[in-house]
């Protein structure tokens, strides 16, 4: 069962991580979530510029997900369909991040409570039954030399390259891959 993240890192407003969100769920092919230039969202077998994402804490346990290359926010319609938007609508583009005990994460629309899924090969209207939450493994992305895409809600906090900007996690404590540098 997913457990809400209680990491002190998420208490630190504006914490920014660059990650690839990888899924290997049985009902999916192995893929990295990518936000494309035209605003479509899909899966890529390999890591790509479109799949490098910036995860930013908006408040404890809630994040926004931005495609670094396309400068588009990951958003979800009330029917669960995903899209990449140039405009950050907090009600469509905020996700609750839940950590699983095996290091994977699940993401839910904060507004609708719907789980984040990569679009399947079949039309979502033809799915025989509702799927459970997709599990994503956040793989670290190298900090790019590029400037931060415009319009992020708050300035970057100091020491964003650190997975422990407030020095609150001791070396002996376990960490989710979501926060691995």
């Amino acid at each position: 069962h997913p457990i809400p993240d209680s990491s002190p890192l998420l208490q630190f407003g504006g914490q920014v991580r660059q990650r690839y969100l990888y899924t290997d769920d049985a009902q999916q092919t192995e893929a990295h979530l990518e936000i494309r230039e035209d605003g479509t969202v899909g899966g890529a077998a390999d890591q790509s510029p479109e799949s490098l994402l910036q995860l930013k804490a908006l408040k404890p346990g809630v994040i926004q997900i931005l495609g670094v290359k396309t400068s588009r926010f990951l958003c979800q319609r009330p029917d669960g369909a995903l899209y990449g938007s140039l405009h950050f609508d907090p009600e469509a583009c905020s996700f609750r991040e839940l950590l699983l005990e095996d290091g994977y994460n699940v993401y839910q629309s904060e507004a609708h409570g719907l789980p984040l899924h990569l679009p399947g090969n079949k039309s979502p209207h033809r799915d025989p039954a509702p799927r459970g939450p997709a599990r994503f493994l956040p793989l670290p992305g190298l900090p790019p030399a590029l400037p931060e895409p415009p319009g992020i809600l708050a300035p970057q906090p100091p020491d964003v390259g650190s997975s422990d900007p407030l020095s609150m996690v001791g070396p002996s404590q376990g960490r989710s891959p979501s926060y691995a540098s």
Epitope: P78, S85, H87, D89, A111
Partner: antibody
Amino acid sequence: EVKLVESGGDLVKPGGSLKLSCAASGFTFSSYGMSWVRQTPDKRLEWVATISTGGGYTYYPDSVKGRFTISRDNAKNTLYLQMSSLRSEDTAMYYCARHDLVDWYFDVWGTGTTVTVSS
Amino acid sequence: QIVLTQSPAIMSAPLGERVTMTCTASSSVSSSYLHWYQQKPGSSPKVWIYRTTNLASGVPTRFSGSGSGTSYSLTISSMEAEDAATYYCHQYHRSPPTWTFGGGTKVEIK
């Protein structure tokens, strides 16, 4: 057919109030950000207000901030604009417009309703 | 606040002529955030070109858009009677969210 139909426009005195409505049909209203845009008598277009999909976030230009309030009722598929402390420069054709999901330009416009502020 | 200035304000062109109008921003605008609308008398504006270069559904291929930074343009390769209208450029600014329009270019048939 995707359709937006505005209503509520009228002749009102300076300092008065007015509430505009926009009835949406043919699409899932709650999935889209919505705005009001006005066109002045000299044909200039001016953005007036924007509201998020769920209605919890609103945005205004300085020219109307504190005087106009945008709201929506997703159950009724209706967008509203409450206007108060109206001025002569608010005289315009008011359009309700839907935002494109991914690029946020105005992809669907209503037919407009006329607001005239005059003594 | 970014200001969009369109020129010329009014232009006349004979049928078949190439027509170009410009939209100049007071500071740099991302090409993803620059759009164009067409409006005919008595009608509502219609999105015509989005994200600088992409033609909206149903827009004839004689129309094209280009530009970057502070300078953008809309071109009609061969003017037709149905193209007589006013064209507005439009910009979205992400933070804080604002939407700005140019003053419009009215295209008439000579």
